[in-house]
């Protein structure tokens, strides 16, 4: 019951996290700037991974997409890549984890298969969360290092003088959404990995042959001594008595009514 709850909760937390990563990736408010050298009107600029917007106090708003790929800063491309990888891994992880859920029965899927799928999805969620956190952190670092340092540098360029506009760059809402969403996906992934341990059937380190009486007459077949000592052809502990002897694995997988006598 606890395993099912852990797995289910991990799935839900990861689902919320991945939805958040998608939302953050699509949002325009990754960085926000107040262009406060403007004598006319308060101008507010905000930028995302895909487009840049200008909003004025008069109510005018205009957004423009980054339609080029080659000319953009390498850091921006890296952040885009990290976020997309995070989304793709998260989406695949969600798909895998749906089939891995203990509460969902699909054919005769064994617990060991579900455990493996749960672990796979858990690892995918962890990597997805780390990608999102890394992407957001790289962008935040880019803002701090590149922009807060550069205010009012003047130099002469073609066609006259050029100066960097004094702007106050701040972290946009998307950064916080991304950090929280990445964290949730990471936590969900860890929960799935924990649930996987509970789902996996415990394996013994030895293969013991257990003998059970399955009927009134147990017919002896030659080769029994070979199996018990480990000599000869029957080294894999295959069934050597018609109804009586089974390996430990077979006992777990196919219990008969006689096993409980």
């Amino acid at each position: 019951m606890a395993v099912t709850a852990c797995q289910g909760l991990g799935f839900v937390v990861s689902l919320i996290g991945i939805a958040g990563i998608i939302a953050a990736t699509c949002m325009d408010q990754w960085s926000t700037q107040d262009l406060y050298n403007n004598p006319v009107t308060a101008v507010f600029n905000y930028q995302g991974l895909w487009r840049s917007c200008v909003r004025e106090s008069s109510g005018f708003t205009e957004c423009r997409g980054y339609f080029t790929l080659l000319g953009l800063p390498a850091m921006l491309q890296a952040v885009r890549a990290l976020m997309i990888v995070g989304i793709v891994l998260g989406a695949i992880g969600l798909l895998v984890s749906i089939f891995a859920l203990k509460c969902i029965r699909i054919g005769s899927m064994e617990d060991s298969a579900k455990a493996n799928m749960t672990l796979t999805s858990g690892i995918m969620f962890i990597v997805s969360g780390l990608c999102a956190i890394a992407g957001v952190s790289v962008f935040a670092n880019m803002l701090v290092t590149n922009f807060w340092m550069s205010t009012a540098n003047m130099y002469t360029g073609m066609g006259g003088m050029v100066q960097t506009v004094q702007t106050r760059y701040t972290f946009g809402a998307a950064l916080f959404v991304g950090w929280v969403a990445g964290g949730l996906t990471l936590i969900g992934g860890v929960m799935m990995c924990i649930a996987c341990r509970g789902l996996a059937p415990e394996e013994t380190n030895y293969k013991a042959v257990s003998y059970h009486a399955s009927g009134h007459s147990v017919a002896y077949k030659p080769g029994g001594f070979k199996a018990s000592t480990g000599f000869g052809s029957n080294t894999k502990n295959k069934k050597i008595y018609d109804g009586g002897a089974r390996t430990e694995d077979e006992v777990q997988s196919y219990p008969s009514k006689h096993d409980y006598v």
């Epitope: 262009l35 403007n38 006319v40 205009e62 953009l72 800063p73 590149n146």
Partner: nanobody, 122 residues
């Protein structure tokens, strides 16, 4: 990389009119505010008029009612219609633009043109 080229300056009689143009070209991503500044001989550069991308305009008190600033966002061009010109309007008129570059759409720059001379004299 980016050029602001002013045109339309010249010699005009007091009470006359002139229309200045400023064309921005190069690897521009987005132009925000654009403005006209002037510098008379021996004086400091002063704001004449400025206009935002959305069309909000502001004028220096000395030119209010006489000058009109406008812009064409699709052509990245700024205009200044100057009417009822006076001798004190004689100056080098500079075009100014706050813009992003395509290569760095996260940083804002102010570019200045090299100026066009307006002489108001009889």
């Amino acid at each position: 990389q980016v050029q602001l080229v002013e045109s339309g300056g010249g010699l005009v009689q007091p009470g006359g009119s002139l229309r200045l143009s400023c064309a921005a070209s190069g690897s521009i991503f987005l132009i925000n505010a654009m403005g006209w500044y002037r510098q008379a001989p021996g004086k400091q550069r002063e704001l004449v008029a400025v206009i935002t991308r959305g069309g909000s305009a502001n004028y220096a008190d000395s030119v209010k009612g006489r000058f009109t600033i406008s812009r064409d966002n699709s052509k990245n061009t700024l205009y200044l219609q100057m009417n009822s010109l006076r001798a004190e309007d004689t100056a080098v008129y500079y075009c100014n633009a706050d813009l992003n570059l395509r290569s760095d759409p996260f940083k804002w720059y102010t570019f200045w043109g090299q100026g066009t001379l307006v002489t108001v004299s009889s």
